[in-house]
């Protein structure tokens, strides 16, 4: 389905993308209602962002090219450190070269900025969408995916990484956010909740979602991950809503059967290729952007994200398979793998429709209160 | 400095397990892909396997079965399970050049640095 | 199973010519090509990663590109000391087995 107050139109069909039909606003708790559970145990007890270094203090970098990113944040954690002897490298995602990023967990010690400093940024992710107060952008034209389906062999790497369950992709998945800002897939991974708990990382009027798909990319301009990051548009994540629906949907299915042979934490196995575009909606046309950070440590800022607007479909029984398969260090479920919603602290959204419209009779005038900031406009 | 350097080569008899050592200084492992590679006297380079970040190895068709890689904090090692007398060759372990970041589908674009090789001489 | 073909196995030339050496993948590897240089007795020399960026220490007479699958390295005003072997290497994955490969090599010789 679509996200909550949109503009109506006519249904694109369901298939494994799931429906085009708007969220009653009924089933959207407020902010205040919301129960605090939902968010992961132990975000909340990090410092306030006043106790923690800031990255205003942080020297500027400027991108390599000026179209690469929407916004043009000021302070990006971004320090040239000596490292590689090939080029210099970004480093602010880290304290030190040496430093292991990996030894983080959801909740609880160690506090995330303490792995990285990036993650106290002002300009992190998730956030929370307003359709509302996003600025339609008519230069944001539908997304293009190219090399998506991929062929039964080689087969790809499905990996619990004690995070998530991660499935590897390899060279050759291209992406383009608009002209001149093309990508490659990285790899895909979900988050989500526990029974009866949704888990989506962005949520949409204070709204969590059963469950959330990232699809990472790398922009073309970088040759590697370490170069990107902390660079504006380096790095890109589609993401997409899961919702449960009637029906198994096929594509997933294809992941979640195999969910079982990777429930210890560091296992992996291997899986055929599959369509990777069959696990986003099909609306490629509808959709939020803004510029944030990873959402996991090393949070780096300067990630594009672009939320779709539909959703996709699973049973009910292949969303509990997903949340209830896994485990994670300690001994623990990997359950409720998500972040808390960060402040946009003066960040627009930008949506590609014009999604502070509402149909609904209430709404005597269309409410547009964001300007559309877009490369191109 | 960063550097990598292989174990002293040696003489082994066909069939005798054998292990080489990458032992690696002025880096942590932790975050960073290591590969070992051949190359048997006169020929070309030839990739035996590959262990990330996270310490999962993989390795070329061929070498599955007859090679183990494994690390632990500082060093990388190569274990020729049963060697033949085509197992002679120099062997090298060489580095990513930069930081890996497996658990972003991140792949290594070049190798630096490289060490020096070591011998291993398979003969009865 | 990644293949890179390389060719072709050995070239001359004469000091300030051009020397290309080529190497096709046998599927999509993106910018994932590097390319080496060797000298007996040495280990392997990184010259060129990600397809077309040259090491800190390599001379500008040096050069790579892409064109789909294909990889050219280029050697513009050969040097005497430019003689020795060079190999390229392709990486499809390093999450499967058969990920990475190389060619075969290609012996310069500088006359």
């Known amino acids: 389905q679509r996200l909550p107050r949109m503009q109506e139109d006519s249904p694109l069909g369901g298939g494994s993308s799931g429906e085009d039909d708007p969220l009653g606003e009924e089933d959207l708790p407020s902010e205040e209602d919301s129960p605090r559970e939902e968010d992961p145990p132990g975000e909340e007890d990090l410092p306030g962002e006043e106790d923690l270094p800031g990255e205003e203090d942080l020297p500027e970098v400027k991108p390599k090219s000026e179209e690469e990113g929407s916004l043009k944040l000021e302070d990006l954690p971004t320090v040239e450190a000596p490292g590689d002897p090939q080029e210099p490298q970004n480093n602010a995602h880290r304290d030190k070269e040496g430093d292991d990023q990996s030894h983080w967990r959801y909740g609880g010690d160690p506090p995330w900025p303490r792995v990285s400093p990036a993650c106290a940024g002002r300009f992190q992710s998730p956030v929370d969408i307003r359709p509302q107060l996003a600025a339609f952008c008519p230069a944001l034209r539908p997304l293009e995916l190219l090399g998506f389906q991929l062929p039964p062999l080689p087969e790809l790497r499905l990996r619990n990484n004690g995070h998530s369950v991660q499935l590897t992709l390899p060279p050759g998945l291209e992406m383009a956010l608009g002209p001149g800002r093309e990508y490659r897939a990285l790899q895909l991974h979900l988050h989500w909740g526990a029974a009866g708990r949704p888990g989506s990382e962005h949520t949409v009027e204070g709204h969590r979602f059963p469950a959330e798909i990232h699809v990472v990319h790398l922009s073309t301009a970088f040759a590697r991950v370490d170069e990107a990051l902390g660079r504006p548009g380096g790095l890109a994540v589609l993401a997409a809503f899961l919702e449960e629906g009637p029906e198994e949907n096929s594509a997933y299915e294809q992941l979640l059967s195999r969910l079982e042979e990777i429930a210890e934490e560091g296992s992996e196995t291997q899986v055929p290729g599959l369509d990777i575009s069959a696990l986003l909606p099909s609306d490629f046309s509808r959709y939020f952007q803004y510029e944030g950070s990873l959402t996991t440590p090393p949070c780096a800022q300067g990630v594009i994200w672009t939320v779709f607007n539909q959703t996709v479909m699973l049973s009910a029984k292949q969303l509990h398979t997903l949340s209830d398969t896994l485990w994670g260090p300690g001994d623990s479920r990997l359950q409720l793998n998500f972040r808390a919603t960060q402040p946009l602290n003066g960040r627009v959204i930008e949506a590609s429709f014009p999604a502070g419209v509402d149909s609904s009779p209430r709404a005597a005038e269309p409410v547009q209160l964001n300007s559309c900031l877009a490369a191109g406009d | 400095s960063q550097s990598v350097k292989e174990s002293r080569g040696r003489l082994v008899t066909p069939g005798t397990p054998l292990t080489l050592t990458c032992t690696v200084s002025g880096f942590s492992l932790s975050r960073y892909t290591l590969i070992w590679v051949r190359q048997a006297p006169g020929k070309g380079l030839e990739w035996i396997g590959i262990?990330?970040?996270?310490?999962s190895a993989y390795y070329a068709r061929w070498a599955k079965g007859r090679f183990t890689i494994s690390k632990t904090s500082t060093t990388v090692d190569l274990k020729i399970t049963s060697p033949t007398t085509e197992d002679t060759a120099t062997y090298f372990c060489?580095?990513?050049?930069?930081?890996?970041?497996?658990?972003?589908?991140?792949?290594?674009?070049?190798?630096?640095?490289w060490g020096p090789g070591t011998l291993v001489t398979v003969s009865s | 199973e990644l293949v890179m073909t390389q060719t072709p196995s050995s070239v001359s030339a004469a000091v300030g010519g051009t020397v290309t050496i080529n190497c096709q993948a046998s599927q999509s590897i993106s910018n994932y090509l590097s390319w080496y240089q060797q000298k007996p007795g040495q280990p392997p020399k990184l010259l060129i990663f990600?397809?077309?960026k040259l090491a800190s220490w390599v001379p500008k007479r040096f050069s790579g590109s892409r064109s789909g699958i294909e990889y050219t390295l280029t050697i513009s005003g050969v040097q005497c000391d430019d003689a020795a072997t060079y190999f390229c290497l392709g990486v499809y994955s390093i999450s499967t087995d058969d990920g990475a490969a190389f060619g075969g090599g290609t012996e310069v010789v500088v006359k």
């Open positions: 060489a580095r990513d050049r930069v930081l890996s970041y497996d658990d972003y589908g991140d792949l290594p674009d070049g190798f630096d640095p």
């Open positions: 262990i990330d970040s996270s310490s």
């Open positions: 990600a397809a077309s």
